[in-house]
């Protein structure tokens, strides 16, 4: 064979974001017939090699980015995508609180803000039901973010947690849930996506607002600017191309 | 639930002997690298000796107990020992199995505290003189 062998996959089961004390399990995932597997954990010259490292009490010390490749007689793979494994828990919830408040007409606009105790510069806000399972979700690292106009698409639940960047792999326990909900709609199936949405955003100052826009075709904070995304191809038909414009703060 | 449990402690006179015993379970023992630390009020805990299964079993020791300290491993009954020896007064400390998940590539990795991800509770070694 010429070249590298492909790269395996690495997944965190259930889920890379693991409470402390709580079990979790990596797998590494090549072709069949693999000779070995090489797990590491990046920046600590610590590893294993098996594919499988069952984590039966999340521990800070194993919180991090981990990689694995694998070898073919002589040959190794390219590593795998590297995974970021998350301590959750490590610190005390902040609160998240929605302004003007957590009910909201269709079109109207609302900001959720994620506020901690901690002089912490990072922040992560997940909608319940996403990401896929095993999928990490998009980040982003920006200060603010401005309001974007609400769709039907952004009901649901609502947490957030907070974290240090000088730490970013221990982070809070989650925010109690906060419930958005979206009035004055009229959601045709075609106008859904076929999957959850996976946004998560991460930004700085203790206190943060947040504006999100759930569509699975543009999830964007650009401040004043007329958006106009194209559906995915693994998406069923959704009509026209649909236009978001986000306003300044 | 991981839990590690040390035993053995006591207070000895100096030139005299311990035989600390750590009991785990919970862990996959077998793939886990095994360390002692100690340590003293007000200061860092010290790394004392580790024991892996790495290519058949690879044991080190800090060089303050070398040649008086044994760190020895059971796997069928998950047990590690630590065996002292030509105790002094300065090995008086609180004593802790540590336990790490994974292997080390690097010289001084398994001395670090950062590279264990289970402690036990300690155990207190008194040497009199």
């Known amino acids: 064979q010429s070249g590298p062998l492909p790269k395996p996959s690495l997944q965190a089961l259930p889920s890379s974001l693991v409470p402390l004390e709580k079990p979790v399990t990596l797998r590494c995932q090549g072709p069949p017939g693999v000779d070995l597997y090489r797990l590491e954990k990046l920046s600590s010259s610590r590893y294993q090699d098996q594919a499988v490292l069952f984590i039966p009490a999340m521990k800070r010390s194993l919180a991090g980015r981990y990689r694995c490749s694998y070898q073919n007689g002589s040959l190794w793979s390219l590593p795998s995508d590297q995974l970021e494994l998350v301590a959750t828990g490590v610190f005390a919830k902040p609160s998240l609180s929605a302004q003007p408040g957590p009910a909201v007409s269709s079109g109207g606009d609302v900001t959720l803000q994620c506020q901690t105790r901690y002089g912490f510069d990072q922040f992560a806000l997940y909608k319940e039901g996403d990401p896929a399972p095993y999928k990490n979700p998009e980040r982003w690292y920006r200060a603010s973010f401005p309001i974007i106009t609400v769709t039907a698409a952004h009901s649901g639940t609502y947490r957030c947690y907070s974290f240090s960047s000088r730490d970013p792999y221990l982070w809070s326990a989650p925010s109690d849930p906060l419930e958005l909900v979206v009035t004055g709609t009229s959601v045709t199936p075609s106008r859904l996506p076929t999957e959850p949405p996976s946004p998560v955003a991460e930004f700085s100052e203790a206190t943060a607002e947040l504006t999100v826009s759930f569509t699975n075709e543009v999830f964007t904070t650009e401040t004043s600017r007329s958006i106009t995304a194209s559906p995915k191809e693994s998406d069923s038909p959704a009509g026209p191309a649909r236009q978001y414009y986000t306003k300044g703060n | 639930q991981v839990q590690l449990q040390e035993s053995g402690g006591g207070l000895v006179q100096a030139g005299g002997s311990l035989r600390l015993s750590c009991a785990a379970s919970g862990v996959t023992f077998d793939s886990a690298a095994m360390a002692w630390f100690r340590q003293v009020p007000g200061k860092e805990r010290e790394f004392v000796a580790v024991?892996?299964?790495?290519?058949?079993?690879?044991?080190d020791h800090a060089d303050s107990v070398k040649g008086r300290f044994l760190i020895s491993r059971d796997n069928a009954r998950h047990m590690v020992y630590l065996q002292m020896n030509s105790l002094n007064p300065e090995d008086t400390a609180v004593y802790y199995c540590?336990?790490?998940?994974?292997?080390?590539?690097?010289?001084?990795?398994?001395?670090?505290?950062?590279?264990?991800?289970?402690w036990g509770q300690g155990t207190q070694v008194t040497v009199s003189s």
């Open positions: 024991i892996s299964t790495e290519s058949g079993g690879r044991t």
């Open positions: 540590a336990s790490s998940l994974l292997y080390c590539s690097a010289s001084g990795c398994y001395a670090n505290r950062d590279s264990y991800d289970y």
